[in-house]
């Protein structure tokens, strides 16, 4: 008969035979034969394989290097890689999170739209009319100008995106 040219899911073709792939968490030691099943062995400590595979070596777990501002978010298993994240105040430079940078601060005139996480930087937005920010901050949002009217005061100095309004007493000489 014709040897197989394709195999079922979780199998692979070798020497005209369909062999079982090794399950996640195990590596290939020897291919199946006509009379024997594929031989697989569990990955060692600090190793993993996350798919059905025919790999002869397991992958090393990612190292979360504290010198790069990294720490372990989720410990790896024989079937999953370690997930790194950044120390407080830092965020990843890429999706793979191989290094960290300090969270960006929003300059005066800008406020925090979205606070940074371990994997995303601060998102700043310009303070719209009626709002201001007079500090460089990674946490402060734009604050609304003070409402002089509610304090029975009048605006003595208009506010900007960087400064609050200055309120003062009403002019009592005015009719």
């Amino acid at each position: 008969p014709e040897p197989p040219t394709a195999c079922r899911e979780k199998q692979y073709l070798i020497n005209s035979q369909c062999c079982s792939l090794c399950q996640p968490g195990q590596k290939l030691v020897s291919d199946c034969t006509e009379f024997t099943e594929t031989e697989c062995l569990p990955c060692g400590e600090s190793e993993f394989l996350d798919t059905w595979n025919r790999e002869t070596h397991c992958h090393q777990h990612k190292y979360c290097d504290p010198n790069l501002g990294l720490r372990v978010q989720q410990k790896g298993t024989s079937e999953t890689d370690t997930i790194c994240t950044c120390e407080e105040g830092w965020h990843c430079t890429s999706e793979a999170c191989e290094s960290c940078v300090l969270h960006r601060s929003c300059s005066p005139g800008f406020g925090v739209k979205q606070i940074a996480t371990g994997v995303s930087d601060t998102i700043c937005e310009p303070c719209p009319v009626g709002f201001f920010s007079n500090v460089s901050s990674a946490f402060e949002k734009c604050h609304p100008w003070t409402s002089c009217e509610t304090k029975d005061l009048v605006v003595q100095q208009a506010g900007t995106n960087k400064t609050d309004v200055v309120c003062g007493p009403q002019d009592r000489l005015r009719a």
Epitope: P1, C32, T33, F35, T36, E37, E39
Partner: antibody
Framework: EVQLVESGGGLVQPGGSLRLSCAAS????????MSWVRQAPGKGLEWVGF??????????EYAASVKGRFTISRDNSKNTLYLQMNSLRAEDTAVYYC??????????????WGQGTLVTVSS | DIQMTQSPSSLSASVGDRVTITCRAS??????LNWYQQKPGKAPKLLIY???RRDSGVPSRFSGSGSGTDYTLTISSLQPEDFATYFC?????????FGGGTKVEIK
Amino acid sequence: EVQLVESGGGLVQPGGSLRLSCAASGFTFSDYYMSWVRQAPGKGLEWVGFIRNKANGYTTEYAASVKGRFTISRDNSKNTLYLQMNSLRAEDTAVYYCARYGGLRQGWYFDVWGQGTLVTVSS
Amino acid sequence: DIQMTQSPSSLSASVGDRVTITCRASQDIRNYLNWYQQKPGKAPKLLIYYTSRRDSGVPSRFSGSGSGTDYTLTISSLQPEDFATYFCQQGKTLPWTFGGGTKVEIK
């Protein structure tokens, strides 16, 4: 009932030939690998060879001690296995068993055996 | 070829005894190890395949264990019908090879 019955054994001179037969019943003969195993008087078991099933093209494998001298064949229409033995030697003297070879990749084994037929090679 | 060494070659035991037969392969056979029982003048009979799986109809007093190169057949409580010769056989690599046999005799 699953059964294997050998025949054809006897006395033969060194250098001579003999053909053994094994009649199978009680199972779908063409689905199985079939084997010959021999046992010299008072000794252990020795695998001689096998013939694969229909799905695997009825190809054969032999032990080094008989390769080129012995031929295994089968007639699936008659449910019969054969062992053609040529250039026989004194050391081929043994009881010859026909055996069904079964199993999966989680382990193959000789699960059905015939009663055996004695082959004596002597002058 | 893979050599199969059985020990002991013979043993004497009484009915009710626990009997252990060992089989050592010359290389790792990954549990592809079968056991057969043979009585005088009869054909061998399959007892256990793939190290520990009993063939249908085989009494539970027969059990197999082992891994790598070392395997064991145990008869937990020897019965009169168990006096016979026992052979191991590796099914990992051609040519299939058998152990030399262990003859279990009545003490």
